[in-house]
């Protein structure tokens, strides 16, 4: 039979290559079948018999057509600061991503190595750039005429209300207090909240759990108002 319609195993033509979903077995010197995702090579091919494939065992996987003798182990369970966005199956590894209110501070090939809590801007500061799944919030001081009186990872600086008669002038951390009954805003306040990072999960209120730490991960409780709370997954 011509090579293009040959059944595995077969010897490739000189200088030729094996077809899609086949590999060249050095020992048998034949083109042999690869195993499909979710399976691995239980018995390698010979000159007269093709590859024998078998299903991956629990907690192991192969994602590609392959001829590996053993399936790959799925990653460890997701840590408490993460959610499982892709379960471990015979065809795919587990993927852990940071939960709402957290971001990935250090990524790995699939998923996240280190999650950290999104920065909360203190009063007088507003969100200049919202957090994403892979970047922290950036805060900025509220410019004259604007304020933020919250500690939040979503609140922006809002304009002071305009008073007919000012009782107490506003500043960066406090709105103006009016003596009249119908204050107006200096401009349309816009959305006070910036969206939480895009996620496939439903959003909840910002969690403030005690961060978890995997063995071997440095976890420093900093002075004072604790800058980044962080957690990690074991590799």
């Amino acid at each position: 039979l011509p090579a293009q319609v040959a059944f595995t195993p077969y010897a490739p033509e000189p200088g030729g290559t094996c077809r899609l979903r086949e590999y060249y077995d050095q020992t048998a010197q034949m083109c042999c079948s690869k195993c499909p995702p979710g399976q691995h090579a239980k018995v390698f091919c010979t000159k007269t018999s093709d590859t024998v494939c078998d299903s991956c065992e629990d907690s192991t996987y192969t994602q590609l057509w392959n001829w590996v003798p053993e399936c790959l182990s799925c990653g460890s369970r997701c840590s408490s600061d993460q959610v499982e966005t892709q379960a471990c199956t015979r065809e795919q590894n587990r993927i852990c991503t940071c939960r709402p209110g957290w971001y990935c501070a250090l990524s790995k090939q699939e998923g996240c190595r280190l999650c950290a809590q999104l920065r909360k801007c203190r009063p007088g500061f507003g969100v200049a750039r919202p957090g994403t799944e892979t970047s922290d919030v950036v805060c900025k001081p509220c410019a004259p005429g604007t304020f933020s009186n919250t500690t939040s990872s979503t609140d922006i600086c809002r304009p002071h209300q305009i008073c007919h008669v000012v009782a107490i002038p506003g500043n960066a951390s406090m709105d103006a207090v009016c003596t009249s009954t119908s204050p107006t805003r200096s401009m349309a306040p816009g959305a006070v909240h910036l969206p939480q990072p895009v996620s496939t999960r439903s959003q909840h209120t910002q969690p403030t759990p005690a961060p978890s730490t995997a063995p071997g991960t440095s976890f420093l409780l900093p002075v004072g108002p604790s800058p980044p709370a962080e957690g990690s997954t074991g590799d």
């Epitope: 501070a105 250090l106 280190l114 950290a116 920065r119 909360k120 801007c121 203190r122 009063p123 007088g124 500061f125 750039r129 892979t134 970047s135 922290d136 919030v137 950036v138 805060c139 900025k140 001081p141 500043n171 960066a172 951390s173 991960t217 440095s218 976890f219 420093l220 900093p222 002075v223 004072g224 108002p225 604790s226 800058p227 980044p228 962080e230 990690s232």
Partner: antibody
Framework: EVQLQESGGGLVQPGGSLNLSCAAS????????LSWVRQTPGKRLEWVAY????????YYSDTVKGRFTITRDNAKNTLYLQMSSLKSEDTAMYYC??????????????WGQGTTVTVSS | DILMTQSPASLSLFVGETVTITCRAS??????LAWYQQKQGKSPQLLVY???KLAEGVPSRFSGSESGTQYSLKINSLQSEDFGTYYC?????????FGGGTKLEIK
Amino acid sequence: EVQLQESGGGLVQPGGSLNLSCAASGFAFSTYDLSWVRQTPGKRLEWVAYINNGGISTYYSDTVKGRFTITRDNAKNTLYLQMSSLKSEDTAMYYCVRGPFYGSANYFDYWGQGTTVTVSS
Amino acid sequence: DILMTQSPASLSLFVGETVTITCRASENIYSNLAWYQQKQGKSPQLLVYDATKLAEGVPSRFSGSESGTQYSLKINSLQSEDFGTYYCQHFWVTPWTFGGGTKLEIK
């Protein structure tokens, strides 16, 4: 234990360049904002540059803007300061510092031992 | 730029005395102020942040206070290890400027 170790200082002629590095250990580097602060021979402290944890946001003092560049490599736990068009007034001890966690925790909580930069002909 | 005017520039005191160092900001810095101590040949160390909060491990004889744009660092019953140079620094808008320093010497 948090450690910040600067290197790369030395003697350079006016108009020359120098690259400072800061190797960090003992904390989750990629979650912290970092800065460079210098101390002049007259003992005045001057904040030089800042970079946020993800390297997205950088700020500079007016005295170095356009001449110095702050960068970081979170995979290597290292902070950098590229200095060009150096002037005699850049002569100082340069400290790598952790912080501020700007807008949230505004302070420098750890300082390195410093590296000396001398700009002179 | 926000100017931080620190006073006095230097002073000489006995162990056991009380001292107050002040820093005046040229505009409102909303309590975004830190105090550092630096000893000869060493790097500065954080003492106080947010104007009034003591950093971890700092003795309670140190205290920070504020009144408008004036910020103060008070050291009760000076100990020999308290002598050195003290700096204030604001963290409002950039540049984050330092005060000129107060050199505290032992008498």
